[in-house]
């Protein structure tokens, strides 16, 4: 094939709290060809209700979001003229709020020196077997790490961060979920700033 | 309506090369693709590639080496060429109507059956 | 290469029958699979693409289901015509790769 893979985003971004609104764009190399948007494992009947002149531009919106919505999305373009594009990398798009927050805090301190380590605890009331730690910054998308407890059995993930410089803020939420809906994530922890030092 | 009819040559020799031809009606090869499709005597069916409305063509991996396929749009012709033919090549080949999103073949030819063997 | 497996070559069934045969891929095809019949005399014909989108004619005893690896052809109320071969395809990535097929016949 010679269709370029495009590129599959979300705007705002791909972790949305439940009832927020998302868009999911996907844009080939071409002007033009369709879109199509698919979910992995099962079929998103919301997107067959997308009107054909967004989808044409590859826009496909949610104006509520919800569990429903939640999973791994690809997406595609192409014609009966031209064949199909290869499909693109994969986007988890994540819905929040789903349980009670979970508690952020660093170990020993949030006072780190500049270079230094942290360990952050992410720690849930109820028993959950994946955690996400999620840094945020003024002007980005959060960036998310996932992990599973730290001990079998376990409500607490432990994230190591570092080494960090002053030269931005450092600023950190997580959540908690359960590995069998692994889109649906608890409601944030309180933000939490690392001071940097130095 | 639509209608695809393939032609080739029934028997092939052994390392020679095999060419068919499918001839379409009631679809314009210049907005739509043609797939390629074999089955060898009791067994199942094997994509070989297709060639899209523009021209360009997709290829299983497995002949890219040996497989071309081309067309003539103003004759409403697709054309197969299989090289170096060996006795594991005999099928019954199909041309077929793919659509591009789900690659799905809505119309086949009747197909034609072809033979390798000295 | 996407292995594409239907595990029962043969069935039987009599006229009236409710008949499934199942299709299994082996990874997630996100519901990219499609079902075509081949009669004796080699005349293939797509039933349903994208899992359960009837194809335009095909009579409406034929339907399908699945997600994720697992899916189905049922056709709810057999009759002489569907006496065929049935082949399943997915249709996500190239190369598109076919199962063995299921052969219905009469009991």
């Known amino acids: 094939g010679h269709l370029p893979k495009p590129t599959l985003w979300a705007e705002p971004g791909s972790v949305i709290t439940q009832g927020s609104p998302v868009t999911l764009r996907c844009q080939g190399g071409q002007e033009t060809q369709e879109y199509r948007l698919y979910r992995e494992k099962k079929t998103a009947l919301w997107i067959t209700r997308i009107p054909q002149e967004l989808v044409k531009k590859g826009q496909f919106p949610i104006p509520s979001i919800t569990w429903e919505h939640a999973g791994r999305y690809r997406c595609y373009y192409g014609s009966d003229t031209a064949g199909r594009s290869e499909s693109s990398d994969p986007l988890e798009l994540v819905v929040t709020g789903a349980y009670i927050k979970p508690t952020l805090s660093a170990q020993p301190s949030p006072v780190v020196n500049s270079g230094g380590n942290v360990i952050l605890q992410c720690d849930s009331q109820v028993a959950f077997d994946g955690f996400s730690l999620c840094k945020e910054g003024e002007d980005e998308h959060p960036q998310c790490l996932n992990s599973q407890p730290h001990a079998r059995g376990s409500s607490r993930a432990i994230f190591s961060v570092g080494p960090v410089s002053p030269s931005r803020r450092w600023w950190y939420r997580c959540y908690a979920y359960d590995s069998n809906s692994p889109y649906e994530w608890s409601l944030p922890s309180d933000l939490l700033e690392l001071l940097v030092l130095g | 309506q639509v209608q695809l009819k393939e032609s080739g040559p029934g028997l092939v020799a052994p390392s020679q090369s095999l060419s068919i031809t499918c001839t379409v009606s009631?679809?314009?090869?210049?907005?739509?693709?043609v797939s390629w499709v074999r089955q060898p005597p009791g067994k199942g069916l094997e994509w070989l590639g297709i060639?899209?409305?523009?021209?360009?063509?997709n290829y299983h991996s497995a002949l890219v080496s040996r497989l071309s396929i081309s067309k003539d749009n103003s004759k409403s012709q697709v054309f197969l060429k299989l090289n170096s033919l060996q006795t594991d090549d005999t099928a019954t080949y199909y041309c077929?109507?793919?659509?591009?999103?789900?690659?799905?073949?809505?119309?086949w030819g009747q197909g034609t059956s072809v033979t390798v063997s000295s | 290469d996407i292995q594409m497996t239907q595990t029962t070559s043969s069935l039987s069934a009599s006229l009236g029958d409710r008949v499934t045969i199942s299709c299994r891929a082996s990874?997630?095809?996100?519901?990219?699979l499609n079902w075509y019949q081949q009669k004796v005399d080699g005349t293939v014909k797509l039933l349903i693409s994208?899992?359960?989108r009837l194809h335009s004619g095909v009579p409406s005893r034929f339907s399908g289901s699945g997600s994720g690896t697992d899916y189905s052809l049922t056709i709810s109320n057999l009759e002489q015509e569907d006496i065929a071969t049935y082949f399943c395809?997915?249709?996500?990535?190239?190369?598109?790769?076919f199962g063995a097929g299921t052969k219905l016949e009469l009991k």
């Open positions: 990874q997630d095809i996100s519901n990219y």
């Open positions: 009631g679809f314009s090869l210049t907005s739509y693709g």
């Open positions: 395809q997915q249709g996500i990535t190239l190369p598109l790769t």
């Open positions: 994208y899992t359960s």
């Open positions: 077929a109507k793919p659509n591009w999103d789900y690659y799905a073949m809505d119309y």
């Open positions: 060639i899209w409305g523009d021209g360009s063509t």
